[in-house]
């Protein structure tokens, strides 16, 4: 047993059929001695009396909100949730395996830029008494700061039957240098509660690895005198490290006809203009990924040719 | 990825070339090893990040581009005296570069060869012949260098009189084909920002 | 204690369909995952599927992909495996078992496909 | 298919010690816990041990279990006549928990 906050703590059991469970001591936080007595959530059974309670702890009923009374007044709380082991593997009931880019990927992160900023996301089914706690740090065993922010339902999407719900969260590395080379990955952890079932979900990776480009910004066409062909030119996002020079892109042009059957055509280029042959009907889209490191491309920006 | 290569034209910042063909080289040769090496710990997740230059070269702080030199962050042990030596400037005019930057990339390098010539005679001696370096990115470090033109002492190529343990070798293969990419990206970063200086 | 009890084999022809039962006492049904495990005759062990307590996620080798569904039913402290399409490789002992360090096997129902 | 692989017989006279090696992958032994389970011939398969090296009360204590790297092994200390049956070994993949990994199976047979 240990204690998540302050009056919550967090029973390990062992999750079989019959387990004999854990049995846990519950101490009232009083100076009284004599008359308390302790009861179960919102039930007025008692369950024992005395300055301290044993209890054994094998399922769900046995966890909850225990109270220590005495003569009608409350002394305090221990909330006890329940962390279940199966087969020498904490359990992952509280959120979906978003199984990309591997299986077991239950958080997944992205950076826009070097900055030391990046988003968390992650997904579940469950829509109500739910709540969830984020840290981060960088390295685990001399851990440097990460600052994040709250966990906010980010979207909610309906498939098939049910109701899919996505929570994220942004988080900042105190002191980021942009061009640093990382040695130690950033460590986030989630703390996830469903009622009284704890599971805590953990993701480790270098921002390098999780770089996606915001797509290129004013994508505009000027058409070439006596050709089909265009020049399409764009810019560097506005969310993406400075100097361009230094944290340089990669471009990939394509043009695209109407139907999705019709053959794409695709050019390569690191500037930031390119000239194709422009058809009716098609459109014209560029993405962008660094130019250096080959993490994300970032979504397509498009116009169309007409 | 297969992209078009662009050949450089011959007024243009002579290294940038050459850094190109280093990171081409790097990725190409970890690829290879991540794939040879299925059965060992050769993946990002897998290894220890160490690098062989720490505490003895200084690159990062020293090829900071200015742009950066504002954030504190990036500060902690950068030190101040501008570039005027090594081919590569050319006949460029750079207020960006400290003394320390173009040098500092080729103590890099010259690291980095001693450790991949040492480790390759070792895995010359394994029976099972499983991997060996790349040639072309021996060589290619050797034509940066090179380019770079900087006269340093010859680091001479460690030997080891013990019975190599094959598995140990591999592994820290992995390491080194890992930091050095990484250092391979922060070269091609300051030779594409010196080349638009 | 804890029991489960099997149901539903025999000898089925090829194409053919076959539902397993798998009945538990003596626990919290509900509150466990449940996996069945077959045995060609003569053979080693084959994991077949996976349920979560709730049922919520479901699991499959990809030998049976597509073929077999696992489902259950907690009100009734069942266990299913609907098997459809059989194909003579599909001859085995089926055994259902509890998720768990410790585990709980049924006594294992005889699947026999031949035409 | 199987990941992990055993011996597919290993032999021994009554006393003699007798071990069972289960070798498998990083993803696989190396990442998770492994379990042992004994199946006598006509009877569903019985566990022995789990988490590695942990024995369920009412297993002999001459069982034992043991994980190293990639690998895990089962030991037998004075094996006996009633020992004689199919051991397997069982772990899961990283990556498709809680699909169950089982090994190849080994027969133990107890001469003389």
């Known amino acids: 047993i240990w204690e998540l906050k302050k009056d919550v703590y967090v029973v390990e059991l062992d999750w079989y059929p019959d387990a004999p469970g854990e049995m846990v001591v519950l101490t009232c936080d009083t100076p009284e001695e004599d008359g308390i007595t302790w009861t179960l959530d919102q039930s007025s059974e008692v369950l024992g009396s005395g300055k301290t309670l044993t209890i054994q702890v094998k399922e769900f009923g046995d966890a909850g909100q225990y109270t220590c009374h005495k003569g009608g007044e409350v002394l305090s709380h221990s909330l006890l949730l329940l962390h279940k082991k199966e087969d020498g593997i904490w359990s992952t009931d509280i959120l979906k395996d978003q199984k990309e880019p591997k299986n077991k990927t239950f958080l997944r992160c992205e950076a826009k830029n070097y900055s030391g900023r990046f988003t968390c996301w992650w997904l579940t089914t469950i829509s109500t008494d739910l709540t969830f706690s984020v840290k981060s740090s960088r390295g685990s065993s001399d851990p440097q700061g990460v600052t994040c922010g709250a966990a906010t339902l980010s979207a909610e999407r309906v498939r098939g039957d049910n109701k899919e719900y996505e929570y994220s969260v942004e988080c900042q590395e105190d002191s980021a240098c942009p061009a640093a080379e990382e040695s130690l990955p950033i460590e986030v952890m989630v703390d996830a509660v469903h009622k009284l079932k704890y599971e805590n979900y953990t993701s480790s990776f270098f921002i390098r690895d999780i770089i996606k480009p915001d797509p290129p910004k004013n994508l505009q066409l000027k058409p070439l005198k006596n050709s089909r062909q265009v020049e399409v030119s764009w810019e560097y996002p506005d969310t993406w490290s400075t100097p361009h020079s230094y944290f340089s892109l990669t471009f990939c042009v394509q043009v695209q006809g109407k139907s999705k059957r019709e053959k794409k055509d695709r050019v390569f280029t690191d500037k930031t203009s390119a000239t194709v042959i422009c058809r009716k009907n098609a459109s014209i889209s560029v993405r962008a990924q660094d130019r250096y490191y080959s993490s994300s491309w970032s979504e397509w920006a498009s116009v169309p040719c007409s | 990825r297969n992209l078009p290569v662009a050949t450089p034209d011959p007024g243009m910042f002579p290294c940038l070339h050459h850094s190109q063909n280093l990171l081409r080289a790097v990725s190409n040769m970890l690829q290879k090893a991540r794939q040879t090496l299925e059965f060992y710990p050769c993946t990002s997740e897998e290894i220890d990040h160490e690098d062989i230059t720490k505490d003895k070269t200084s690159t990062v702080e020293a090829c900071l581009p200015l742009e950066l030199t504002k954030n504190e962050s990036c500060l902690n042990s950068r030190e101040t005296s501008f570039i005027t030596n090594g081919s590569c400037l050319a006949s460029r005019k750079t207020s960006f570069m400290m003394a320390l930057c173009l040098s500092s990339i080729y103590e890099d390098l010259k690291m980095y060869q001693v450790e991949f010539k040492t480790m390759n005679a070792k895995l010359l001696m394994d029976p099972k012949r499983q991997i060996f370096l790349d040639q072309n990115m021996l060589a290619v470090i050797d034509e940066l260098m090179q380019a770079l033109n900087f006269n340093s002492e010859t680091v001479p190529q460690k030997s080891s009189l013990e019975e190599p343990d094959f598995y140990k070798t591999k592994i820290k293969l992995c390491i080194l084909l890992h930091a050095f990419r990484i250092r391979a990206v922060t070269i091609d970063r300051v030779m594409s920002y010196l080349n638009a200086s | 204690q804890v029991q489960l009890v099997q149901s539903g084999g025999g000898v089925v022809q090829p194409g053919r369909s076959l539902r397993l039962s798998c009945a538990a006492s003596?626990?919290?049904?509900?509150?466990?995952?449940m996996h069945w495990v077959r045995q060609a005759p003569g053979k080693g062990l084959e994991w077949v599927a996976f349920?979560?307590?709730?049922?919520?996620?479901?699991y499959y080798a990809d030998s049976v992909k597509g073929r077999f569904t696992i489902s259950r039913d907690n009100s009734k402290n069942t266990l299913y495996l609907q098997m459809k399409s059989l194909r003579a490789e599909d001859t085995a002992v089926y055994y259902c078992?509890?998720?768990?360090?410790?585990?709980?096997w049924g006594q294992g129902t005889m699947v026999t496909v031949s035409s | 298919s199987y990941v992990l692989t055993q011996p597919p017989s290993v032999s021994g006279t009554p006393g003699q010690r007798v071990t069972i090696s289960c070798s498998g992958g990083?993803?696989?032994?190396?990442?998770?816990?492994v379990k042992w389970y004994q199946q006598l011939p006509g009877t569903a398969p019985k566990l022995l041990i789990y988490?590695?090296?942990q024995r369920p009360s009412g297993v002999p204590d001459r069982f034992s279990g043991s994980k190293s790297g990639t690998s895990a092994s089962l030991a037998i200390t004075g094996v006996q006549a009633e020992d004689e049956a199919d051991y397997y070994c069982q772990s899961y993949d990283r990556g498709t928990h809680p699909a169950l990994l089982f090994g190849t199976g080994t027969k133990v047979t107890v001469l003389g």
């Open positions: 988490g590695n090296d």
């Open positions: 003596g626990f919290t049904f509900s509150s466990y995952g």
């Open positions: 078992k509890t998720h768990g360090s410790h585990d709980n």
């Open positions: 349920i979560r307590y709730d049922g919520s996620n479901k």
């Open positions: 990083r993803s696989n032994i190396g990442s998770t816990t």
